[in-house]
Each structure stands twice: as structure tokens, then as C-alpha cells.
């Protein structure tokens, strides 16, 4: 996973994850690997 973007200097890329298994289905429209939520109850 890219942690930095090289522009005029190094800028921290604040990574967000699909952290909770229950979010996998509900976040299919999001950019998987970049966003996360809390536990989603079906």
C-alpha cells in the first residue's frame, strides 16, 4: 500500500481500510482498501 505521495515533498497518505468483514459487502461501491467503517449489522 502506498503510504506517501511525492509532490513538492513527502505528504502522508492517511490510509483507510475495509477493516470489518461486515463492511465488505456494503462497501462494494467504495474504493476497497481505502475506506473503513465500524461493524455493520445485517
Amino acid at each position: 500500500d502506498a503510504e506517501f505521495r511525492h509532490d513538492s515533498g513527502y505528504e502522508v497518505h492517511h490510509q483507510k481500510l475495509v477493516f470489518f468483514a461486515e463492511d465488505v459487502g456494503s462497501n462494494k461501491g467504495a474504493i476497497i482498501g481505502l475506506m473503513v467503517g465500524g461493524v455493520v449489522i445485517a
Epitope: 477493516f19 470489518f20 461486515e22 473503513v36 465500524g38 449489522i41
Partner: antibody, heavy 112, light 112 residues
Framework: EVQLVESGGGLVQPGGSLKLSCAAS????????MSWVRQTPDKRLELVAS????????YYPDSVKGRFTISRDNAKNTLYLQMSSLKSEDTAMYYC?????WGQGSTLTVSS | DVVMTQTPLSLPVSLGDQASISCRSS???????????LHWYLQKPGQSPKLLIY???NRFSGVPDRFSGSGSGTDFTLKISRVEAEDLGVYFC?????????FGGGTKLEIK
């Protein structure tokens, strides 16, 4: 930058009520579920409430069911935890969390 | 609920040593999509937990490569190849495969 900032903690007498708030920024709050996790004085972590992205579904463990209510206002990017009938065993640091990011915590002390 | 059991409770190390922490779950953490939602946090004194490793072996943003995670099914390990002073604190494993989100009891990494 992702930020979760809790507020509303304090000292409450047994049987009392308190409402915690968590202001979220740096991500699309309305798209994701959120949780409240508490850390007891012995440093153990316990999930106390979760809510899905639109607020339509919630989860509570038996230890707080019927006493705690989680809610959210997606227009204000804010998560809430309403706590009532508080007991001494609810004394803890309460964290707003999205899995990979946690707030700084809000302290609840239940004591007479 | 899935019970997460961490060992040891306390881990005294010398700076520069390798450290290893074990975490076992009461049931398999493999989700239906094949991924395993086992994570590691570090909590330093006076701070909230910070994510180190997600989904068994992936380092979170900014986490040094001296941290590595491994394991499968119900048996997982966090290794720190060369312990530095900034690594001291309490390490928690956590699972988010099953509802509710649950946590290990913590392992305190301290100077020998």
C-alpha cells in the same frame, strides 16, 4: 486527516445518565458504521455499541442492552452514546472508533 | 462471542531484542470472502490504541517494517524484530470477522 473527537464524559452518580458525542472528520462519515469501545480500569477493551452507516441497525452486548443507545447524525458527522441507569462497573474510558482510527477517549466515572 | 487469548501477559525485553506475542481465537477468523480479519494495536501510556497490523500481516500507514504479523485460522503471532524504546506499551489483538468486534486481554511490552 482522519479525526475522531469525543466529548461529554464526567462524574455521574449510580443510576444517573450521560450522553457522549464523537465529532468525525477526514472521511465520508455517512458511508460507514461506527462503534463505541470502552476500556475498563483493568485496561481491557470491550465493544459497547455499534451502528451501521444509515443508523438503521445497531448492536449492543448484554452488559449494556436496554441502558445504552447509540445514534448518529450524518448531517453533523457526529456519533452519540446515550447512557442511562449507570452502574459502577460502567466506569471506563470510552472511545469512538472506526476500526483503524480511534478518538482520544472520554472518561466516565460512576460513583456516589 | 469470539474469545481472543493473548500470551504472554507481560513481555520483558532488552532494546534491540526480538519480541513475539501470540494470539489465539476461539473460532476460525476466516471470513466467507477468504480474508482473515485479525488485527494488532499498540496502546502507549495515556494514548488510545493505534493500529499496527491489519488482516494478519499488513502494516498500517507509517508502521515500521520491524513489525510483522503472521498466522492463520485461529493462531496468530506479532513479531518485533528489533525492539526500540518507542515500541513499549500494551499490544492488543482484535478480530472483526465476527460480530461483535472482540479484543485480546493485552500484552505489556516492557524493559527487562
Amino acid at each position: 486527516e482522519v479525526q475522531l473527537v469525543e466529548s461529554g464524559g464526567g462524574l455521574v452518580q449510580p443510576g444517573g445518565s450521560l450522553k457522549l458525542s464523537c465529532a468525525a472528520s477526514g472521511f465520508t462519515f455517512s458511508s460507514y458504521g461506527m462503534s463505541w469501545v470502552r476500556q475498563t480500569p483493568d485496561k481491557r477493551l470491550e465493544l459497547v455499541a455499534s451502528i451501521n452507516s444509515n443508523g438503521g441497525s445497531t448492536y449492543y452486548p448484554d452488559s449494556v442492552k436496554g441502558r445504552f443507545t447509540i445514534s448518529r447524525d450524518n448531517a453533523k458527522n457526529t456519533l452519540y452514546l446515550q447512557m442511562s441507569s449507570l452502574k459502577s462497573e460502567d466506569t471506563a474510558m470510552y472511545y469512538c472508533a472506526s476500526g483503524d482510527y480511534w478518538g482520544q477517549g472520554s472518561t466516565l466515572t460512576v460513583s456516589s | 462471542d469470539v474469545v481472543m487469548t493473548q500470551t504472554p501477559l507481560s513481555l520483558p525485553v532488552s532494546l534491540g531484542d526480538q519480541a513475539s506475542i501470540s494470539c489465539r481465537s476461539s473460532q476460525s477468523l476466516v471470513y466467507s470472502n477468504g480474508d482473515t480479519y485479525l488485527h494488532w494495536y499498540l496502546q502507549k501510556p495515556g494514548q488510545s490504541p493505534k493500529l499496527l497490523i491489519y488482516r494478519v500481516s499488513n502494516r498500517f500507514s507509517g508502521v515500521p517494517d520491524r513489525f510483522s504479523g503472521s498466522g492463520s485460522g485461529t493462531d496468530f503471532t506479532l513479531k518485533i524484530s528489533r525492539v526500540e524504546a518507542e515500541d513499549l506499551g500494551v499490544y492488543f489483538c482484535s478480530q472483526s470477522t465476527h460480530v461483535p468486534w472482540t479484543f485480546g486481554g493485552g500484552t505489556k511490552l516492557e524493559i527487562k
